[in-house]
C-alpha cells in the first residue's frame, strides 16, 4: 500500500469522556492537521477511516460498527458512542484516504468511571470569575451536537453533591448557571446534568466546571514591595551571612505574568563575582493575589559585599516597582540603628 | 472623608411605598459594592439587599424580595432603595453601607426611619 | 442560610475589667467574620474584621479571634465609651447574616 502520512499520536487531545454516557468525538484531522475540512475532503473522493488499539495491547482493530442500538456509529467526521463502556478505553486513529493519497492520526480515549457525587478522574475546565462582580454566567460546556435544538433537555445543576436549589447568589438558568455578586464561598465543582430522548432512549451528560473566585480587575495594582524597605538596615560585620528578603505583594490579573528579580550595582545576581544564593517561594491569598519572596543571600560577606547597592525589582502587567535594601557594615559610620 | 447619609424616611401606610437615597462623598462609589441594612426599634441588625460595584447584580433578604429594588447611579454617586407594598414589620431604621469582601461593612450613614402604619 | 448566636444576651463588666463576648456559627464561615460596636441612637461601627484584624481607628484594647463557627471578641480593660450593644456578623455566604447582638453594661 502506499505511503501514508502519520500525524503520530496526538496526546495534546486527551479526550476523557464518562462511562455510560454519549461521546460525540471528531476526527482531529480536520481541526488541527489538515488545511480542509470534511465536506471537501468527501467531495474529493477521499473516505474516513476508523479503527482502534485497545488498552494494554499493540494490535489495531477495525471498530465494530454493527454493534446492538448501534452503539457505536460514524456520523462525517464524527464517531458516536452511544454511550460509552469502559472498555471502549484506548487509542483510536481516523485514516483518511483514497488510493493515492492518505494521511492518519491516532488520539487517547479515556472512559473515566463517576460516583453518584460526580467525583472521579476527569480533569476538570476551570473558570475564573471576579469576586463582587455584578453577575456571571457559567454555561454547560461540550453539549452542542448531541441533540437537535428542537429538543429541550432538562438541565440539573449541582454544587458538589447537592442539587442547587434555593442557593441565595446562585441561580440556574437552564444551560446557564449565573452567579450574582460572588464570593469565595462559591469556589468548587459546579455540575451540570443534561437529559435528552433519542430514539425512545433517555441519554445523560454529566459536564463539570471548578469555579475559582479571584481578585477584581478594579483592585489591580503595580507590584507592592514590603521588604526590603526603608526601616530595616541589614547591619553586618564581614565575613556574616548576609540574608535580605525581597517579598512582593501582586494582586490578581488574569494572565499577568509576576516577575521579581535582585540587582546588585545594577546587575543581574549571575553577571557579578560575588557568590549569591538565590531562593525563591511562592504564596497565594484566597483569590489568587500573589505574595513571591526572593531571599538574596551571602554566605561570608566581604566589606566590598557591604558597600554594593542591592535592589529588588518587581513588574506585573500594572507597572514596576524598585525599593534597595539599607546594607551597612556594622561599626562604620552612624545611621540610624537597625530595627525589625 | 467617608460620608453616607441617607434620605427619604418617614411614616407611609401599608401597602404603600417609599424611596431611600444614600449619597456617598469621600470616596469613589463605582468601587465599592453597597448595601441596605435596617433595625426594627429595639431589635438587632437584617440585611436588606446588596448592589455590585458595577450596579450589574443584586441580592435581597427573602423577607423583601419581590417588593424592593436596589439601585445606584455612580455618576451622582448615590444608592437607593425603591420600598414598595410596604408592610408594618418593614418599620426600623434603614442604613446604608459600604462593604468589600475583604473588609464586610466598613462604613455606615446614620441610618433613616421608615413607618409603616395605618 | 447561616445563623450567628451570640451569647451571653447581657454582660455585666465592671470599668477597667475584661469582656469576652462569643459568637458561633451554624456552619464554618472561615475567617469571614466581623464585630461592631452599636450605642444608642448611634449607626454600628466597624470593629474586627476578617476575625482577628482591627478596623482603622480601633483601638488595641479590641481583639477578635477564631475561625470556622467559633469566635471571640475580647475587650481586655473596659473604659466607659465601651459600653454599648456587639454585633458579629458572618460575610463569608450570601446572605450576609448577623448575631442577636451582645448588650454590654456597666455592673
Known amino acids: 500500500s502506499e505511503r501514508c502520512d502519520d500525524w503520530g499520536l496526538d496526546t495534546m487531545r486527551q479526550i476523557q469522556v464518562f462511562e455510560d454516557e454519549p461521546a460525540r468525538i471528531k476526527c482531529p484531522l480536520f481541526e488541527h492537521f489538515l488545511k480542509y475540512n470534511y465536506s471537501t475532503a468527501h467531495s474529493s473522493g477521499l473516505t474516513l477511516i476508523w479503527y482502534w488499539t485497545r488498552q494494554d495491547r499493540d494490535l489495531e482493530e477495525p471498530i465494530n460498527f454493527r454493534l446492538p442500538e448501534n452503539r457505536i456509529s460514524k456520523e462525517k467526521d464524527v464517531l458516536w458512542f452511544r454511550p460509552t463502556l469502559l472498555n471502549d478505553t484506548g487509542n483510536y486513529t481516523c485514516m483518511l484516504r483514497n488510493t493515492t493519497y492518505c494521511s492518519k492520526v491516532a488520539f487517547p480515549l479515556e472512559v473515566v468511571q463517576k460516583d453518584s457525587c460526580f467525583n472521579s478522574a476527569m480533569r476538570f475546565p476551570v473558570h475564573k470569575m471576579y469576586i463582587e462582580h455584578g453577575i456571571h454566567k457559567i454555561t454547560c460546556p461540550n453539549v452542542d451536537g448531541y441533540f437537535p435544538s428542537s429538543v429541550k433537555p432538562s438541565v440539573t445543576w449541582y454544587k458538589g453533591c447537592t442539587e442547587i436549589v434555593d442557593f441565595h447568589n446562585v441561580l440556574p438558568e437552564g444551560m446557564n448557571l449565573s452567579f450574582f455578586i460572588p464570593l469565595v464561598s462559591n469556589n468548587g465543582n459546579y455540575t451540570c446534568v443534561v437529559t435528552y430522548p433519542e430514539n425512545g432512549r433517555l441519554f445523560h451528560l454529566t459536564r463539570t466546571v471548578t469555579v475559582k473566585v479571584v481578585g477584581s480587575p478594579k483592585d489591580a495594582l503595580p507590584p507592592q514591595i514590603y521588604s526590603p524597605n526603608d526601616r530595616v538596615v541589614y547591619e553586618k560585620e564581614p565575613g556574616e551571612e548576609l540574608v535580605i528578603p525581597c517579598k512582593v505583594y501582586f494582586s490578581f490579573i488574569m494572565d499577568s505574568h509576576n516577575e521579581v528579580w535582585w540587582t546588585i550595582d545594577g546587575k543581574k545576581p549571575d553577571d557579578v563575582t560575588v557568590d549569591i544564593t538565590i531562593n525563591e517561594s511562592v504564596s497565594y491569598s484566597s483569590t489568587e493575589d500573589e505574595t513571591r519572596t526572593q531571599i538574596l543571600s551571602i554566605k561570608k560577606v566581604t566589606p566590598e559585599d557591604l558597600r554594593r547597592n542591592y535592589v529588588c525589582h518587581a513588574r506585573n502587567t500594572k507597572g514596576e516597582a524598585e525599593q534597595a535594601a539599607k546594607v551597612k557594615q556594622k561599626g562604620n559610620g552612624c545611621t540610624e540603628p537597625m530595627t525589625l | 472623608e467617608v460620608q453616607l447619609l441617607e434620605s427619604g424616611g418617614g411614616l407611609v401606610q401599608p401597602g404603600g411605598s417609599l424611596r431611600l437615597s444614600c449619597a456617598a462623598s469621600g470616596f469613589p462609589l463605582s468601587n465599592y459594592g453597597m448595601s441596605w441594612v435596617r433595625q426594627a426599634p429595639g431589635k438587632g441588625l437584617e440585611w436588606v439587599s446588596a448592589?455590585?460595584?458595577?450596579?450589574?447584580?443584586?441580592l435581597y433578604a427573602d423577607s423583601v424580595k419581590g417588593r424592593f429594588t436596589i439601585s445606584r447611579d455612580n455618576s451622582k454617586n448615590t444608592l437607593y432603595l425603591q420600598m414598595n407594598s410596604l408592610r408594618a414589620e418593614d418599620t426600623a431604621v434603614y442604613y446604608c453601607?459600604?462593604?468589600?469582601?475583604?473588609?464586610?461593612?466598613?462604613?455606615w450613614g446614620q441610618g433613616t426611619l421608615v413607618t409603616v402604619s395605618s | 442560610e447561616i445563623v450567628m448566636t451570640q451569647s451571653p444576651a447581657t454582660l455585666s463588666v465592671s470599668p477597667g475589667e475584661r469582656a469576652t463576648l462569643s459568637c458561633r456559627a451554624s456552619q464554618s464561615v472561615s475567617s469571614n467574620l466581623a464585630w461592631y460596636q452599636q450605642k444608642p441612637g448611634q449607626a454600628p461601627r466597624l470593629l474586627i474584621y476578617?476575625?482577628?484584624t482591627r478596623a482603622t481607628g480601633i483601638p488595641a484594647r479590641f481583639s477578635g479571634s477564631g475561625s470556622g463557627t467559633e469566635f471571640t471578641l475580647t475587650i481586655s480593660s473596659l473604659q466607659s465609651e465601651d459600653f454599648a450593644v456587639y454585633y458579629c456578623q458572618q460575610y463569608n455566604n450570601w446572605p450576609w447574616t448577623f448575631g442577636q447582638g451582645t448588650k454590654v453594661e456597666i455592673k
Open positions: 448592589i455590585s460595584y458595577d450596579g450589574e447584580g443584586t
Open positions: 476578617g476575625a482577628s
Open positions: 453601607a459600604r462593604f468589600r469582601y475583604y473588609t464586610a461593612f466598613d462604613y
